[in-house]
Amino acid sequence: DAHKSEVAHRFKDLGEENFKALVLIAFAQYLQQCPFEDHVKLVNEVTEFAKTCVADESAENCDKSLHTLFGDKLCTVATLRETYGEMADCCAKQEPERNECFLQHKDDNPNLPRLVRPEVDVMCTAFHDNEETFLKKYLYEIARRHPYFYAPELLFFAKRYKAAFTECCQAADKAACLLPKLDELRDEGKASSAKQRLKCASLQKFGERAFKAWAVARLSQRFPKAEFAEVSKLVTDLTKVHTECCHGDLLECADDRADLAKYICENQDSISSKLKECCEKPLLEKSHCIAEVENDEMPADLPSLAADFVESKDVCKNYAEAKDVFLGMFLYEYARRHPDYSVVLLLRLAKTYETTLEKCCAAADPHECYAKVFDEFKPLVEEPQNLIKQNCELFEQLGEYKFQNALLVRYTKKVPQVSTPTLVEVSRNLGKVGSKCCKHPEAKRMPCAEDYLSVVLNQLCVLHEKTPVSDRVTKCCTESLVNRRPCFSALEVDETYVPKEFNAETFTFHADICTLSEKERQIKKQTALVELVKHKPKATKEQLKAVMDDFAAFVEKCCKADDKETCFAEEGKKLVAASQAALGL
C-alpha cells in the first residue's frame, strides 16, 4: 500500500513517542560517537518535520524516502569528518549507496567508555528530575554500544527499565529492589544483542536464503502443528522484519513486527496452542513473548520422513520442479519432528540432503544413489551429541570459572593471534554454555548449547572482521555459517604461531585488584592466563593450573596484607620468577 508520505505513514502508525525513540536508536546506531544532546536535537527536528507531513502529506519534502530524510539529517552534523573520518565520505553519495555506506561503518566494538552504574540514590534523583531525558539516555547508550540491537526489542527493554525505576525508587530499600532488576536487564540485553547480531550477520554475509533456512527450521520446531504454507508465510514476514532492522530501516521494521504479531495472534489456532497468554499482552510484551514462546507439542502419528524424501520415486521430479520449496519442505518436516536437534544441525542435514540430490538426480539410477541418504545423517547427529556430553561432564567437574579457563586455554592455543580481550570475552561466554544448558534434560541440551555457541562464535567473527589477524578465524567464519562451530572445534594447536615475548609488565598486579568485584577479578586472572598461553603455547594443563593456583593464592594473600601495595610488588616479583621457572620461560 503506497503512501504519499512515508514519514507521515510511520508517524501515524507508531505514535510520537515510539517514532522519536526509534529515530534516536537509528541515529545512535549510525553515529556512535555523537553526544546525546546532538542526537536529541536531530531527533526533535525530524519529529517536527514528520508532524508537518502528518498535517499535509503534500508538503515540501514529505514524499522523500526515510533513508533520504534521515541521511540528509545525519549529514548536517558539523563534526562528521573529524569524529568519523572516512565515514564523512558517505555523505557525498546518493541513496541507496549512502545508507549502505553508513551501514558498513557501524562499529561492533566502538571506542566508548564502559558504562559505570551510579549510586542508586543518584539514579533515582536523575529519574525523578527528568524522566524523559533519563530514559532517552538509556536508549542512546545501549544503541550506540550495540549498533545492531533489535530496535523494537530495545523499546521493550526501555519499558522494563522505566518500570524498574518507577517501582524501586519508591521502595524502602531502593538498592535491594533495583539492582537485581538492572542486572537482569543488562544480562538479557547483552544476550538479545548477540542473538540479533547473528541474524544480521546471517543476512548480510550469507544472504536471505541462509536466513530463511534458519527461520524455517526454528519456526517448524516452535510451531510443529502449523502447515508448511503457514510456516512459509511467517518466514517471509519475519525475514522482511529482520532485513529492515539489520538495514537500518527501524521504523518499517518495528511497524512490520507489530503487524506480524497481530497476524500470529489472529491466526493462533492454525499456528500454535502456546500463544494464548502472549496474545493477551500489550504490543511490546506480546512481540517479545511470541519470540520466546516454548515449542508446541508435536502432532501425534507423524508419518516417517523416508516415504516422501527417500522411498518415493518422485523425489528427483519434485526436487527439479521447485528446488528450494522441496528442500524447505524437507527442512520443515525434519525440524517439526526434531525439537531435540539444534537449528544448525538441522541445516547441516538439509545441506547434506541437497548435496546428495544434486549428485544423485544426475546419476543413472537416482533412487539407488540416494537410497541411503539418511545413513549419512548419523555421524552429523552424533558429533554435537558427543561434544555436548563431554563438555557438560567437564563443566560439572570444574564449575563455571574453571570451565571457562579450560576453554580460554583451548581457544588461545587454536587462535593465539586474536587479541587477549576478545579471547577472554568470547571464552567466558562460551563457558557460560555450561550453566545455561547442561542443567537441561538430553532432549533440550543440543538446541540450547549448539545454537547458543553459534551466537557466541558470531561475536568472535564480527570482532575479528574489524581487525583480521588470523586466517584460521577468517576461514571458519566465512566458509559456512552452519559449520562455524564444527570448524572451530576441529582446530588444533596453531603450530605456526611464534610465542609472544615475555613482558613482566603484563603480569604485574596492584592493590586495586582487591576492590574489584568477583567478576572483574576473574577477568584479570583470565587475562593473565591468556597471556601465559600466548607466551608458552605448549604449556601443559598441569603447568598452567599450578601457575594459576599460585596466582590465586598470591592475590588472596596480598589482599589480606596490611601493606597491600608492597606485598603485590615484592610477592609479585617472586611469583613471576617462579612462574617463569615452572613454565621454562
Epitope: 501515524k12 502508525d13 505514535g15 525513540a21 523499546l155 526501555a158 507489530a258
Partner: nanobody
Framework: ELQVVESGGGLVQAGGSLRLSCAAS????????MGWFRQAPGKEREFVAA????????YYADSVKGRFAISGDNAKNTVYLQMNSLKPEDTAVYYC?????????????????????WGQGTQVTVSS
C-alpha cells in the same frame, strides 16, 4: 468525515464524580486507540487517558492515576471516562480523540499529534 462527539461535562464539587462519553461515527476508520485530553485556560492540551482496542490496554497520566478510569466499547466506537475524587485542578475542556496510533507508546505517554480526529470538547468545572 469522522464525527467525534463528547458529552457528560458539567459543574461538580470537589470530591465529586462525573462520567464523560464519546462516540465516533461516520466513515469507516481504523481506530486502534481512543483517548481523552484536556486543556485548561492558557495551558497546552495534555494527555489524560487512552484505551487500545487490540488488547484493551489502558494508559493514564500520572496526575489522574487511581482517580479516573477509561473504558470503551469497540463495536460501538464509544469510549467513557469515569472521573472520581475530582479536584479544582481538573477543571478544563475535555477532548475526545480517535484514530490513534496502532502502536502503544513504550513509555505510556500519548501526544495530541498521535490522534487523527477530535471532538469539540466538553467543559468540566470543579468548584472548591
Amino acid at each position: 468525515e469522522l464525527q467525534v462527539v463528547e458529552s457528560g461535562g458539567g459543574l461538580v464539587q470537589a470530591g465529586g464524580s462525573l462520567r464523560l462519553s464519546c462516540a465516533a461515527s461516520g466513515r469507516t476508520f481504523r481506530s486502534n486507540t481512543m483517548g481523552w485530553f484536556r486543556q485548561a485556560p492558557g495551558k497546552e492540551r495534555e494527555f489524560v487517558a487512552a484505551i487500545t482496542w487490540s488488547g484493551g490496554t489502558t494508559y493514564y497520566a500520572d496526575s489522574v492515576k487511581g482517580r479516573f478510569a477509561i473504558s470503551g466499547d469497540n463495536a460501538k466506537n464509544t469510549v467513557y471516562l469515569q472521573m472520581n475524587s475530582l479536584k479544582p485542578e481538573d477543571t478544563a475542556v475535555y477532548y475526545c480523540a480517535a484514530e490513534g496510533p496502532k502502536w502503544e507508546p513504550w513509555n505510556g505517554i500519548y501526544h495530541p499529534a498521535d490522534f487523527g480526529s477530535w471532538g469539540q470538547g466538553t467543559q468540566v468545572t470543579v468548584s472548591s
